[in-house]
């Protein structure tokens, strides 16, 4: 027997859509072989209608697609705008049509239920609103208006003009009688439930002269949209529920056991702990649509997600919803990168950020995730030379090592720097990673003086002490600016005496500035690296003043604070500075970003918080 499995019978009605899932053993060969959907002919052949290699028959043009989910061993055929001509016997299969690797599917498309003559069909999504219009004649204008629902053989009163409301509809139904000019009354039902579906009868008058109108209400539960994303990548759920719920609280939840749908995030400020640091709910548009970005996808993130609107900020019966089935592909193209980087107060961290190597020219960004409200990610630095003012002299984004990785260095760490940071680009929105910076106990490994004052026209020598653990590393001094840190010549002065229990392999490397000018004022970093991979750094601010007495200045470590005082950042520290990553449209489909530095997007960023790898900073 064939190992392919699927639905034996699919039944639907004209105008509807079907989504047919075919299951296959997910062997390496099966995953990559051709998938097809064909129609069986009377003589036994099977004519391909759509295949995974891009073929689409003219019969299916613009209304069908085939998506392969190799990780799950499934492929899905979606067919929209069904007609009775689509009824027939089909096969879904692998390889070539005539081989046995297929499954027979019977598709039957009917006209719909036997509706009474003059029946108006209303097709409405679950949770939305329907307005059933009921015309009547002048002689019934003053008579009772009512709506009944056919339950089995009996009509049951739903609402009438005398004020009766069936308990099943309390709080979500009203009967409107139009102005005298219009011979029409309407029944409006909100927050539609699946159980509301069925045959309705509206009536004006109660005697034999009453006017009657039949209505057939179909309530559609949304088919989950299948979403397939890479482990460690990111996913964006775009949720458009319509303007009628623009002012209602929105939520994204994940279905667990039973009826439960656990809130992942909502606009009332709730967020599931598992998504801390890796989720943003983007502000909604005027039409009530919004989007949720989840980065650093983990295996356990796979499942069924619903977005919806309800005043409680969680799924309730009658919530309008959209649904997705998220699959997480473990054969990910996104490389593993540390999810936690540790540093000590006064020390530094160097964070490696992966990006899609095909997009080496894309603009790189680093932002600080904030959990307040629905989450936001104000930019701190980019690869075009912009650095947030409060980070000047202590933050740098370097294109090195390149080929799919850039580096962010942050030094002069304080406890305020602990938190989640996102690496992203203006290119591939799936390549967003999150790293958590933790500030741990310990002393910085590199020792430099505190602030240093140089004298115009004189020579300044600034020492940097490297412990023996860095004996095999390249040691450097550089001058910080917005675009990076320009290397400067430095002198190895031999072993350092700044470390206890450290042998001859410790080093004192000095920066010498000859004939100091005003242009020499600024931040200088000493640091270590191995090839293009950066390690720890320490920063010194050099101020320049007028000459007081002749001579050169040689700054000793004693004059400095080993760990600089924690800076008290002004209250604007966490403000948006119109650099917050919010607007989902910017990095999404529109790759041409107007001026990304003024409007950058966190709506689609990504992390590997799913891995427990850690990267040390200044101290382990």
């Amino acid at each position: 027997k064939s190992p392919i499995f699927g639905p034996e019978e699919v039944n639907s009605v004209e105008g509807n859509s079907v989504s047919i899932t075919c299951y296959y053993p997910p062997t390496s060969v099966n995953r990559h072989t051709r998938k097809y959907w064909c129609r069986q002919g009377a003589r036994g052949g099977c004519i391909t209608l759509i295949s995974s290699e891009g073929y689409v028959s003219s019969k299916y043009a613009g209304r069908a697609n085939l998506t392969n989910f190799p990780e799950n061993g499934t492929f899905v055929v979606n067919i929209a705008q069904l007609s009775q001509d689509d009824s027939g016997r089909y096969k879904c299969g692998l390889g070539i049509n005539s081989r046995g690797l297929s499954f027979d599917v019977s598709l039957e498309v009917s006209q719909g239920p036997g509706l009474l003559n003059d029946t108006k069909v209303y097709t409405v999504d679950l949770g939305r609103t329907v307005t059933i219009n009921c015309p009547f004649k002048t002689e019934n204008a003053q008579k009772r208006k009512s709506l009944y629902k056919q339950i089995g053989l009996y009509p049951v009163l739903v609402i009438d003009s005398s004020g009766y409301v069936n308990p099943n509809y309390t709080g979500r139904i009203r009967l409107d009688i139009q102005g005298t000019g219009q011979l029409l009354f309407s029944v409006v039902i909100n927050q539609l439930r699946l159980s509301d579906a069925g045959q309705y009868l509206c009536q004006a008058g109660d005697d034999s002269n009453s006017n009657k109108k039949n209505a057939d209400l179909q309530v559609l539960k949304p088919e989950p949209e299948l979403v397939y994303e890479d482990l460690r990548g990111s996913v964006t759920f775009h949720c458009a529920l319509g303007p009628e719920v623009a002012n209602v609280a929105k939520f994204l939840c994940r279905q667990s056991s039973g009826e439960n749908c656990d809130v992942v995030v909502n606009t009332l400020g709730k967020r599931a702990p598992a998504f801390e640091g890796r989720i943003l709910l983007n502000p909604q548009d005027k039409d009530g649509s919004f989007s949720v970005v989840i980065t650093g996808l983990r295996k356990e993130d796979a499942g069924r997600y619903l977005c919806g609107a309800h005043s409680d900020g969680q799924l309730q019966e009658g919530s309008p919803i959209q649904a997705w089935q998220l699959f997480v592909n473990e054969e990910s193209t996104i490389p593993r990168s540390p999810t936690v980087v540790k540093g000590v107060a006064g020390g530094s961290v160097a964070v490696l950020c992966p990006y899609n190597r095909k997009e080496s020219k894309s603009i790189k960004y680093w932002c600080l995730w904030e959990g307040a409200q629905n989450g936001r990610c104000p930019l701190l630095v980019d690869s075009e030379g912009w650095v947030k003012a409060q980070y000047e002299g202590r933050l740098s984004l370097l294109e090195e090592p390149g080929n799919g990785t850039f580096t962010v260095i942050l030094n002069q760490l304080t406890s305020r720097d602990a938190g989640f940071y996102w690496c992203l680009t203006n290119g591939d929105t799936l390549w967003r990673t999150t790293v958590e910076i933790k500030i741990i106990e310990g002393e910085p490994n590199l020792k430099v003086p505190g602030n240093v004052t140089a004298v115009l026209g004189e020579t300044l020598k600034v020492p940097c002490h490297f412990p023996c653990k860095f004996s095999s590393y390249e040691k450097y001094w550089c001058k910080w600016n917005n675009t990076g840190c320009q290397a400067l010549p430095s002198q190895d002065e031999g072993p350092s005496k700044a470390f206890v229990n450290c042998d001859e392999n410790s080093r004192l490397v000095s920066l010498t500035l000859n004939l100091v000018t005003r242009a020499d004022e600024g931040w200088y970093w000493c640091g270590v690296k191995q090839g293009h991979f950066y390690g720890e750094t320490a920063a010194v601010y050099v101020a320049v003043e007028e000459r007081k007495a002749a001579g050169s200045r040689d700054v000793s470590l004693a004059k400095a604070d080993a760990a600089p005082d924690e800076k008290v950042l002004d209250s604007g520290f966490r403000e948006i500075e119109n650099k917050a990553i919010q607007d989902p449209r910017l990095f999404a489909e529109e790759k041409a970003v107007a001026d990304t530095r003024d409007q950058a997007d966190g709506s689609r960023a990504s992390v590997d918080s799913g891995s427990s790898e850690e990267q040390g900073g200044s101290s382990r």
Epitope: P7, N11, N72, E259
Partner: nanobody, 129 residues
Framework: EVQLVESGGGLVQTGGSLRLSCAAS????????MGWFRQAPGKEPERDFV?????????????YYADSVKGRFTISRDNAKNTVYLQMNTLKPEDTAVYYC?????????????????WGQGTQVTVSS
């Protein structure tokens, strides 16, 4: 919570027929996948897939069957009664088992019992030769 109650089991001769019913009650608004599984004597805790029905609205539904019951068993539902049926024809002794009704919000694979959220208590079907 959703409750599922099976009925219709019993003793039948080889070649005979039975119709099992599974009535759902409670908060069923998002249950739209129902399946039948069976557990043969001495096979605990293994439950084998028999048939499943998934619907996306009142007008679109999908029926799945295990190879062993194809052509003999039919799954159907009565939406108004919130009930799913399993019509079993041409019964064989190897169909003897406890039959369980299962319900869920959505399944990735109808054959996998873990994908269903609710289960009934089971009804015994015995086919004698």
């Amino acid at each position: 919570e959703v409750q599922l109650v099976e009925s219709g089991g019993g003793l039948v001769q080889t070649g005979g027929s039975l119709r099992l019913s599974c009535a759902a009650s409670g908060r069923t608004f998002s249950s739209y996948a129902m399946g039948w599984f069976r557990q043969a004597p001495g096979k605990e805790p293994e439950r084998d897939f028999v048939a499943a029905l998934r619907w996306s609205n009142d007008r679109t539904y999908y029926k799945y069957y295990a190879d062993s019951v194809k052509g003999r068993f039919t799954i159907s539902r009565d939406n108004a009664k919130n009930t799913v049926y399993l019509q079993m024809n041409t019964l064989k002794p190897e169909d003897t088992a406890v039959y369980y009704c299962a319900g869920g919000n959505y399944f990735s694979d109808p054959r996998v019992d873990k994908e269903y959220n609710y289960w009934g208590q089971g009804t015994q079907v015995t086919v004698s030769s």
